[in-house]
């Protein structure tokens, strides 16, 4: 709390301008009316105030808006945003995408801070869903944003927003998240033709079920190994050798390099060795000829 002292004669601020950078903390407190600050907020960011001076200005705004800043003030916070706590931000009601962009710009180049996370949370909750424009904006600033959301939060993403997602936005998503996103992507891209569809859906295939992979294997898509390695193990296991060969096309040769890694390792263990031998890749570990394969999981389900 800045000590209350009278403003020295002639120092009362009539405008928010550059001259204020020479004011000591107590002078800012005494000589800058909160009402003046509120009307001319857009000037604050253009003036190189020190962090200590920004503390004084924040204190004035906090006092002026005990229930949280209005959007007309929030959109002009600029570097003052870095002074806000998540508790401050939880009081806000941010509805304008322009306001969100302005504040994200202040934090650009830094990791997502608790303040930014709270701001985004307030914004998305206010909108009710992650619409395309919002997703576009958030992933532009934070490519990993989508993968930072819980499956529950991702469920509020409408299929139409999936068009805004770039492959790099999904790099850090885990299977649980892709399970939610894949059906939305499938719906969003359903009217595209085969090759175009595959280009768009490829990044989401970590959430695809077996039947969709089987369908893709009939379309000469030539899936690369990197994509194949991200597929759900439980979705890959039921695929036949012929289906995997069709799915990967010329990339099938890459299976040899990945034979010790999931899901390739687990898939190999489920195939007959003589089927694997037809690939001519020297893949080992399949079921020897003459062995009967019992699906124990099916047996348990029946008993």
């Amino acid at each position: 709390e800045v000590e209350k002292t009278a403003c020295p004669s002639g120092k009362k601020a009539r405008e928010i301008d550059e001259s204020l950078i020479f004011y000591k903390k107590w002078e800012l407190e005494a000589c800058v009316d909160a009402a003046l600050l509120a009307t001319q907020m857009d000037r604050v960011n253009a003036i190189p105030f020190t962090y200590e001076q920004l503390d004084v200005l924040k204190h004035k705004l906090d006092e002026l808006y005990p229930q949280g800043y209005p959007e007309s003030v929030i959109q002009h916070l600029g570097y003052l945003f870095l002074k806000m706590s998540p508790e401050d931000i939880r009081k806000w009601n941010v509805t304008s995408l322009e306001t969100l962009k302005a504040l994200l710009e202040v934090n650009k180049g830094h990791e997502m801070s608790p303040q930014v996370a709270t701001l985004i949370d307030r914004f998305v909750k206010g909108r009710g869903q992650l619409d395309k424009d919002t997703l576009d904006t958030l992933t532009a600033f934070y490519p990993g944003y989508l993968c930072s959301l819980s499956p529950e939060e991702l469920s509020s993403v409408p299929p139409s927003s999936i068009w805004a997602v770039r492959p790099q936005d999904l790099d850090t998503c885990d299977p649980r998240q892709l399970d939610v996103l894949y059906p939305k992507a499938r719906l969003a891209f359903q009217n595209m033709n085969g090759s175009e569809y595959f280009v768009k859906i490829q990044s989401f295939l970590g959430g695809a079920p077996t039947e969709d992979l089987k369908a893709l294997s009939q379309q000469n898509v030539s899936m690369d190994l990197a994509t194949f390695m991200k597929l759900r193990t439980d979705a890959v296991l039921p695929l036949t050798v012929a289906e995997v060969q069709k799915l990967l096309g010329p990339h099938v040769e890459g299976l040899k390099a990945e034979e010790r890694h999931r899901p390739v390792r687990d898939w190999i263990l489920r195939q007959r060795q003589d089927d694997l031998d037809t690939l001519g890749l020297g893949l080992q570990g399949g079921i020897p000829n003459g062995y009967l394969v019992l699906d124990l999981s099916m047996q348990e389900a029946l008993s």
Epitope: A38, E63, Y65, P66, Q67
Partner: antibody, heavy 119, light 114 residues
Framework: EVQLQQSGPELVKPGASMKISCKAS????????MNWVKQSHGKNLEWIGL????????SYNQKFKGKATLTVDKSSSTAYMELLSLTSEDSAVYYC????????????WGAGTTVTVSS | DIVMTQSPSSLAVSVGEKVTMSCKSS????????????LAWYQQKPGQSPKLLIY???TRESGVPDRFTGSGSGTDFTLTISSVKAEDLAVYYC??????????FGGGTKLEIK
Amino acid sequence: EVQLQQSGPELVKPGASMKISCKASGYSFTGYTMNWVKQSHGKNLEWIGLINPYNGGTSYNQKFKGKATLTVDKSSSTAYMELLSLTSEDSAVYYCARVGGSSWYFDVWGAGTTVTVSS
Amino acid sequence: DIVMTQSPSSLAVSVGEKVTMSCKSSQSLLYSSNQKNYLAWYQQKPGQSPKLLIYWASTRESGVPDRFTGSGSGTDFTLTISSVKAEDLAVYYCQQYYTYPTWTFGGGTKLEIK
């Protein structure tokens, strides 16, 4: 001396619109939010809305949205309130009031403009 | 919106007497971060516009006589005039300015001189 000088009384017909002015002097007009307050029957005070003279930004009491429109002319340090589609319910004294220095109390008031809506 | 209730609606006192009037808000006007109450008192003399007397519940506006005192916290507030003068004949209003920008006024207390 800080002063707010309001325009004179008005007698208007129902359905008409009218504009009240409030000329500020003695302080930096763009540094303080201007508010408008309605007083009906010589008693109840109701906050109508505010305007930021610096950038023209406005906020209205939900009750007066569509009824009042606030504007400013920075060059003459004058705030205006236009009242639309007047009815007898709008007969009242209307005040402009400057917001206080440290918060949203009103430290300077105009003398008021009496509006009478009658056919 | 916060509802402000003033009582009594009117009272008559003799010159020199002490007078108190009450203002209650439907929710607390105390902001815990600065321990300030967002309440103002105004005086409106007959035929005049309102005049600010008190802000922050207890801070007298410059030029206001010290016989006027504001007190209270949270939801209950009082304006006291320690020794009434004939010129204090007026209606007194309280106003909350806690909820930006939906500020509300009380219905007023009319002070009459016997």
